[in-house]
């Protein structure tokens, strides 16, 4: 039995996968910040996790996915105020009793040191210094990401 948050995450991810693949993104759009091969957008407003997920989707992006501790640190370095929390694309899957990224992969326990409980309706936020489990209904800011994928590295069939 999937929770409503899990369903929302799966629905949005599936709809993103159905869309026609666009040409690679060479530069970050206005107001987005480049971090290595990604463009990040830090919201100014606050929303619950599922609204944040939906907002990133409308921007043809996703909530932030963090590959490893190194990427976490570099992302945290972009956060100017240590008191501010941002949603990322990680929430607790009740059916699988594990932290699950919105791309369907599970959290490697070594990647993030999460403060707080792993339980139903828990979603992950990051601050300048830490990673927290919060109720998904909490209204905080969020980070969207777009992958920078240079066109010259893309291989399209029938081209």
């Amino acid at each position: 039995q999937k929770s409503s948050i899990e369903k929302c995450s799966v629905d949005i991810q599936q709809s993103r996968n159905k869309t026609t693949e666009r040409p690679g993104l060479l530069n970050c759009p206005i107001y987005w910040q480049q971090l290595r091969e990604k463009c990040l957008l830090f919201s100014h407003t606050v929303n619950p996790w599922n609204n944040s997920l939906a907002d990133c989707s409308t921007k043809e992006s996703s909530l932030l996915l963090i590959r490893d501790k190194d990427e976490l640190i570099h992302t945290q370095n972009l956060i100017r105020d240590k008191a501010i929390l941002f949603w990322i694309g990680l929430n607790f899957s009740l059916s699988e009793k594990n932290w699950k990224w919105i791309n369907g992969s599970f959290l490697n326990s070594n990647d993030l040191e999460i403060r707080g409980d792993a339980k139903e309706n828990s979603c992950i936020s990051i601050s300048q210094t830490s990673v927290y489990s919060e109720y998904c209904s909490t209204e905080i800011r969020w980070i969207c990401q777009k992958e920078l994928t240079p066109v010259r590295n893309k291989v399209y069939p029938d081209s």
Partner: antibody
Amino acid sequence: QVQLQESGPGLVKPSETLSLTCTVSGDSFSSYYWSWIRQPAGKGLEWIGRLYTSGSTNYNPSLKSRVTVSVDTSKNQFSLKLNSVTAADTAVYYCARDPLGSFFDYWGQGTLVTVSS
Amino acid sequence: QSALTQPPSASGSPGQSVTISCTGTSSDVGGYNYVSWYQQHPGKAPKLMIYEVSKRPSGVPDRFSGSKSGNTASLTVSGLQAEDEADYYCSSYAGSNNVVFGGGTKLTVL
């Protein structure tokens, strides 16, 4: 170049509903937020409300009970409805692009709405 | 009553510098680095001049600069030119997804 164009009646009777539409061209409509702002003659600016193209909205607390902002993404349009208007609602109404939720980088030219019987 | 307080007027001669202040509280200006400034000529729509306290959109001359200290933000126009004569409004994020404006300052180039 991003362009915004407000449209709607210039005269509304007291106690009725003010309705305006903003048409956006020249940009990815769904990638931004969109706001309504008003300015009474000779006075300052007042933020009315914001629309996320995902469908959620935020409103100025002082107007929240009377305001609805909605979207038609297929037409690249968003709308304002302000009910139970009085003469104090007479103003130039602007629509604006609201990139991150705290500032407005492109504005419509504004439309004057007068509330009078 | 505007949420943010600006002086009603400011003036300077061509070539001089003028600073316009915008005072709020710890719930708006002091609490967030999300202050913006707008220029409005008579009968025209406002134009964004500064956002996030000190960032300038492309096309805005570098004569315009923004800063913040505590609960007060400032817009400085250096090397004043005749076309800078306009009304200037500050704005700030105010928490709970709300945005507030100042009452405006009329800048006169003498």
